[in-house]
């Protein structure tokens, strides 16, 4: 039975050109983790393997850091950013957990977080 | 120590069908998203296809001369990779490799020496 | 579908810095790949991501990839480095190689 859930930054807002960390954080679960994959829409953003460590895609090589954790730091964002992130936590020997994201590039110098959510 | 070891090439009449095995050692081989490659007598290297791990999907891509024909899978279980190779023409004739894509910094394995498939009536 | 364009033949002389370029349309948004390969021999990775070196690898062999070029360098190149050289253009969808260049340490 999977028991865990999955913590995320919920929806969050920044200023285009600016940057922001995608953080999820997977709890009540003993679970191990095995690999994290960070997903828009169907594109994949990056990987972090816990044997291997990360792979960035190539498509955003040259914008998105690893970390800090299992989170992805998004830098130099366009207003093309805008929508939805997923982490996916594969685990054993729970399975596929998946958390949502949705992120707003704002052309304003207002950009406000929103709050934290849980997804069972 | 990372090693590759490709087996299963022969002589095979155009139209024919093969299946290619690689096993795989030294590594998590579960975790590694694997490709074929070929090289014709001569010739320079090319991309057959490829096949993601199951945490990425476990999905599949091939090069446009071999789509429809060619089928990759993988059992982790066994840590080998295969190639399905049906309806095979004479210019499939070439030394085949497995692959590993390079991904991950510390994992960037060597090649394989591969099997040559001569395809020939 | 997607191409690679490498010159079919590089001269250097011995100790001196060759440079192998490989051109593809928006090739600075995948990641390119380059192997060596020797006569009778399996090819070698030898830049992956860019510009990153397997252990192994001399510390002269470097890579680079922006706009549509990607190349390979070798400084102060040495006899052993006589070879083809194969650039790869990598993503998560699909992968070419070039047609390869041949190196001659004169």
């Known amino acids: 039975m999977m028991t865990g859930t999955i913590e995320t930054t919920g929806n969050i807002s920044a200023e285009k050109g600016g940057s922001i960390i995608l953080q999820c954080h997977l709890s009540s679960t003993t679970a191990q983790v095995t690999q994290v994959n960070w997903e828009q829409q169907d594109q994949l953003l990056a990987i972090c393997n816990a044997d291997l460590g990360w792979h960035i895609s190539p498509s955003f090589k040259d914008r998105v850091a690893p970390g800090p954790g299992l989170g992805l730091t998004l830098q130099s964002l366009t207003v093309n950013d805008t929508g939805e992130y997923f982490c996916i936590y594969h685990t054993y020997p729970d399975g596929t957990y998946t958390g949502r994201i949705f992120l707003e590039v704002l052309e304003s110098s207002v950009a406000e977080h929103g709050a934290r959510f849980q997804i069972p | 120590e990372v090693q590759l070891v490709e087996s299963g090439g022969g002589l095979v009449k155009p139209g024919g069908s093969l299946r290619l095995s690689c096993a795989a050692s030294g590594f998590t081989f579960s975790n590694a998203w694997m490709s074929w490659v070929r090289q014709a007598p001569g010739k320079g290297l090319e991309w057959v296809g490829r096949i993601k791990s199951k945490t990425n999907g476990g999905t599949t891509d091939y090069a446009a001369p071999v789509k429809g024909r060619f089928t990759i899978s993988r059992d982790d279980s066994k840590n080998t990779l295969y190639l399905q190779m049906n309806s095979l023409k004479t210019e499939d004739t070439a030394v085949y490799c497995c692959t590993i894509d390079p991904l991950y910094d510390i994992l960037t394995g060597p090649w394989g020496q591969g099997t040559l498939v001569t395809v020939s009536s | 579908p997607y191409e690679l364009t490498q010159a079919p033949s590089v001269s250097v002389s011995p100790g001196q810095a060759a440079s192998i370029t490989c051109s593809g349309d928006k090739l600075g948004d995948k990641y390119a790949c380059w192997y060596q390969q020797k006569p009778g021999q399996s090819p070698v990775l030898v830049i992956y991501q860019d510009s990153k070196r397997p252990s192994g690898i001399p510390e002269r062999f470097s890579g680079s990839n922006s706009g549509n070029t990607a190349t390979l360098t070798i400084s102060g190149t040495q006899a052993m480095d006589e070879a083809d050289y194969y650039c790869?253009?990598?993503?998560?969808?699909?992968?070419?190689f070039g047609g390869g260049t041949k190196l001659t340490v004169l």
């Open positions: 790869q253009a990598w993503d998560s969808s699909t992968v070419v």
